[in-house]
């Protein structure tokens, strides 16, 4: 089946990801109209070879023409219009640069296949994988619905049969007693023996029917329990396990998890059927007590049936007790499962058996590391106490969907102090951000004479005592939930498993897509793979150790890959979110690739990327310019860090950025955002209009204030080939170039440091080349 057809059958959450792949640069209609042809071309090759790209591009235009004529024959006016518009757009945008469209299509196809792979893996592994596909799930769920309906029907049928048995048994009982009393009378007066014989035969027939019915009911009950067991296994081992896996994935930024309501309906329906069946089995006992005989099937089988139904119900209740919302600090909603001591966190448990009679009946108690008391001490882990309201009664009123749940909003952790500063043992094998702890929830259910102990626990949490531990703690949460669906392996980091690049790539992309509107492209991921794994062609399947991901410093750097990336994520979220969402920040791009794509561009073309040498996270721009001899130069400005972006928005820095040439003229080297978006078009809307900067004038002064504008300036010589960044100088020493190379990023061309000026503007200085 064609890739495009397969994609159409995926679940909504995948389709949403698919929609994100397509934009105006490669419209989805085109992908749809020419699906088979598009899939038959070698776009990756075209993306790397101009001559082939030109050929494929012209063929693409030809295919559009053919499709257009088909629509013409079908009189499909709308599609004709769309195709004509698409063709005009493609010609205007890519005729001169066919490699670019090839690159875009190649990326889309690659992302599509990755999407299908994710979905397929999920389907095969049934819950071990990230998120099952819709086609598979729907079919599976329809089957489940069918089985549940079948169970309900069988329970109702049995109800009817029990009534029939009861009626017959009452008749038998009455006739038997009547005959017995008549028999006693006949003993006295020796009356009609043939009538008695007839009545005896009738009783025998009744008893035969009764026995047959009882056998039938016992056998049907056994079959029903097997059917229930099957449905229960499907619900708990597949559906609930899938939901739990999806919850893990959602916790680390993956697609949001589905709602529990449907699962709750299924589990409640099954639990109701089980209780009804349990009543029927009790009824058998009553029937047996009224009438019993040699070989009575009830005597033989009822105890085993009773045992089985109780066990099924008990297990269903235990499985139905889940952590609906994993522990999370409200101030860090996108980083659940990391808890800082002394800071409030929230969590929510839910019982997926929605019995109104249980409302306000279940008192939940929370504790931490319940089963690992001694083990923790041996391992040298820290020990904690839970403070705050650590008991709560489950109710149906607090949640807006009427689910039976308990939300804990005011919990905090406090470390138990030991003699040696909190660690129970000096030679602790794990660092604190690799220590995993479990929060346990317990309650007791008393229902229809049964006492059931319920217990569930959170996914492993990492407890930190300082917010600076957050990056490493979050890395632990990512690694754990990426690589295991074991819900309670607190010893995970004693021998952390190895991840593959495909797994890591997906999770890294989620770190962006979960808090911004855009994940990482194939090219961005390839750059990251290169940083982690060194130069290579195909990173798929390459192994990445926990140490490489987050503990060891990167080659030639004083910090790890994760620390660097996490700071970039923070930078994006706090300072350049809008620009990232627009797709204006290329971000992760190797120096070679940067040079390759910029060198063919006109002077003034620039791109935005993240600093590779700044531990704290920095963003820079690189542009093309010609030197006096007409030679193309690639220049980069020294990266802007959070500190600088605190004072001035990145968009305003870009809009106002100047270089001062040898004649002290300020010129803007940034004209087009790669590939060819005019700077004003891209960033203008993110800069405050000058009229709004100082809306008020001092009423006491005769003239209004002079307006000021901050701009960033890089001083340079005519040759524009400074190899080292300059230290900031005062305006007086602007032309004295410093030689402070600290923190410099080696760059293909010059690397510039910018100075920020506060320039006063009056109507007289309009000649200044701003």
């Amino acid at each position: 089946m064609a890739q495009w057809n397969q994609l159409q059958q995926l679940d909504t959450r995948y389709l949403e990801q698919l929609h994100q792949l397509y934009s105006d640069s490669f419209p989805m209609e085109l992908r749809q109209f020419l699906a088979p042809w598009i899939e038959s071309q070698d776009w990756a090759y075209a993306a790397s070879k101009e001559s082939h790209a030109t050929l494929v591009f012209h063929n693409l235009l030809g295919e559009i023409d053919q499709q257009y004529s088909r629509f013409l024959q079908e009189s499909n006016v709308l599609y004709q219009h769309n195709l004509r518009r698409i063709k005009q757009f493609l010609q205007s945008r890519y005729l001169e640069k066919p490699m670019e469209i090839a690159r875009i299509v190649a990326r889309c196809l690659w992302e599509e296949s990755r999407l299908l792979q994710t979905a397929a893996t999920a389907a095969q592994q049934g819950g071990q994988a990230n998120h099952p596909t819709a086609a598979v799930v729907t079919e599976k769920q329809q089957m489940l619905e069918q089985h549940l309906q079948d169970v309900r029907k069988r329970v109702q049928d049995l109800e009817q049969k029990m009534k029939v048995v009861e009626n017959l048994q009452d008749d038998f009982d009455f006739n038997y007693k009547t005959l017995k009393s008549q028999g006693d009378m006949q003993d006295l007066n020796g009356n009609n023996q043939s009538v008695t014989r007839q009545k005896m035969q009738q009783l025998e027939q009744m008893l035969t029917a009764l026995d047959q019915m009882r056998r039938s009911i016992v056998s049907e009950l056994a079959g029903l329990l097997s059917a229930m067991e099957y449905v229960q296994k499907t619900l708990t081992d597949e559906e609930l396990a899938d939901w739990k896996r999806r919850q893990q994935i959602a916790c680390i930024g993956g697609p949001p998890n589905i709602c529990l309501d449907r699962l709750e309906n299924w589990i409640t329906s099954l639990a109701e059927s089980q209780l009804q069946t349990r009543q029927q089995i009790k009824k058998l006992e009553e029937l047996q007590q009224k009438v019993s005989y040699k070989g009575d099937p009830i005597v033989q089988h009822r105890p085993m049936l009773e045992e089985r139904i109780v066990e099924l119900f008990r297990n269903l209740m235990k499985s139905a007790f889940v952590v609906e919302r994993q522990p999370c600090m409200p101030m860090h909603p996108d980083r659940p499962l990391v808890i800082k001591t002394g800071v409030q966190f929230t969590t929510k448990v839910r019982l997926l058996v929605k019995f109104p009679e249980l409302n306000y009946q279940l008192k939940i108690k929370v504790c931490i590391d319940k089963d690992s008391g001694d083990v923790a001490a041996l391992r040298g882990s820290r020990k904690f106490n839970i403070l705050g309201t650590n008991t709560k009664v489950m109710n149906m009123e607090e949640s807006n969907n009427g689910s039976l749940s308990a939300e804990f909003k005011h919990l905090t952790l406090r470390e138990q102090r030991c003699g040696n500063g909190g660690r129970a043992n000096c030679d602790a094998s794990l660092i604190v951000t690799e220590e995993l702890h479990l929060i346990t929830f317990e309650t007791e259910v008393y229902h229809q004479g049964l006492k059931i102990d319920l217990e569930t626990h959170s996914l492993p949490v990492v407890v930190i005592s300082n917010i600076c531990q957050m990056p490493n703690a979050w890395a632990s949460i990512l690694w754990y939930n990426m690589l295991t669906n074991n819900p309670k392996n607190v010893n995970f980091f004693t021998k952390p498993p190895i991840g593959t690049w495909d797994q890591v790539a997906e999770v890294l992309s989620w770190q962006f897509s979960s808090t911004t509107k855009r994940g990482l492209s194939i090219e961005q991921l390839t750059t990251l793979a290169e940083k982690l794994l060194g130069p290579g062609v195909n990173y798929s399947g390459c192994q990445i150790t926990w140490a490489k991901f987050c503990k060891e410093n990167m080659a030639g750097k004083g910090f790890s890959f994760w620390v660097w990336l996490d700071n970039i994520i923070d930078l994006v979220k706090k300072y350049i979110l809008a620009l990232w969402n627009e797709g204006y920040i290329m971000g992760f791009i190797s120096k070679e690739r940067e040079r390759a794509i910029l060198s063919t561009k006109p002077p003034g073309t620039f791109l935005l990327r993240f600093s590779e040498s700044s531990k704290e996270g920095g963003v820079t721009f690189t542009w093309v310019e010609k030197d006096i001899s007409g030679k193309t130069q690639i220049q980069s400005v020294e990266p802007y860090t959070k500190q600088q972006l605190n004072n001035m928005s990145f968009a305003e820095i870009i809009m106002g950025y100047k270089i001062m040439d040898a004649t002290n003229i300020l010129v803007s080297p940034l004209v087009y955002l790669y590939p060819d978006i005019p700077k004003e078009e891209a960033f203008g809307k993110y800069c405050r209009p000058e009229s709004q900067e100082h809306p008020e004038a001092d009423p006491g002064s005769a003239a209004p204030y002079l307006k000021t504008k901050f701009i960033c300036v890089t001083p340079t010589t005519c040759s524009n080939t400074i190899d080292l960044p300059m230290s900031p100088r005062t305006l007086d020493s602007l032309m004295q170039f410093g030689n402070n190379g600290e923190g410099a990023e080696p760059s293909a061309g010059g690397q510039f440091e910018s100075l920020t000026f506060d320039m006063e503007l009056t109507s007289e200085c309009a000649t200044s080349p701003m």
Partner: nanobody, 127 residues
């Protein structure tokens, strides 16, 4: 609740034929047994023929074997009894009955296994 209405009875000469029908409403065609019984005044009700709701099992009393045929139309929820080569001893009130239980050999004609009964239709065969 199941309601059963028989029809098709009447008077016929020996050797003649009749087709009885039994229309069932509210009938749950689950694992069940449907049958024809007959009763002559002053005698026990006896089984004539039974069929399982799926039609896999058909059983006849020795006295009617080879002459009577039981069938059903599940789309119409109707049971039939085709009676050929009728004899005077076939004269009786014919009842249609259903059981919520499966058809079991030892209780095929045990009337206590059947929990829903029709009002009956009279068949008279004269010599």
């Amino acid at each position: 609740h199941v309601q059963l209405v028989e029809s098709g009875g009447g008077s016929v000469q020996a050797g003649g034929s009749l087709r009885l029908s039994c229309a069932a409403s509210g009938f749950n065609s689950g694992d069940s047994c449907i049958g024809w019984f007959r009763q002559v005044p002053g005698k026990e009700r006896e089984g004539v023929s039974v069929i399982s709701s799926g039609g896999e099992i058909r059983y006849y009393a020795d006295s009617v074997k080879g002459r009577f045929t039981i069938s059903q139309d599940n789309t119409k929820n109707t049971l039939y009894l085709q009676m050929n080569s009728l004899k005077p001893e076939d004269t009786a009130m014919y009842y249609c009955a259903t059981s919520v239980f499966l058809c079991y050999p030892r209780t095929w004609f045990n009337r206590y296994m059947y929990n829903s009964w029709g009002q009956g239709t009279q068949v008279t065969v004269s010599s």
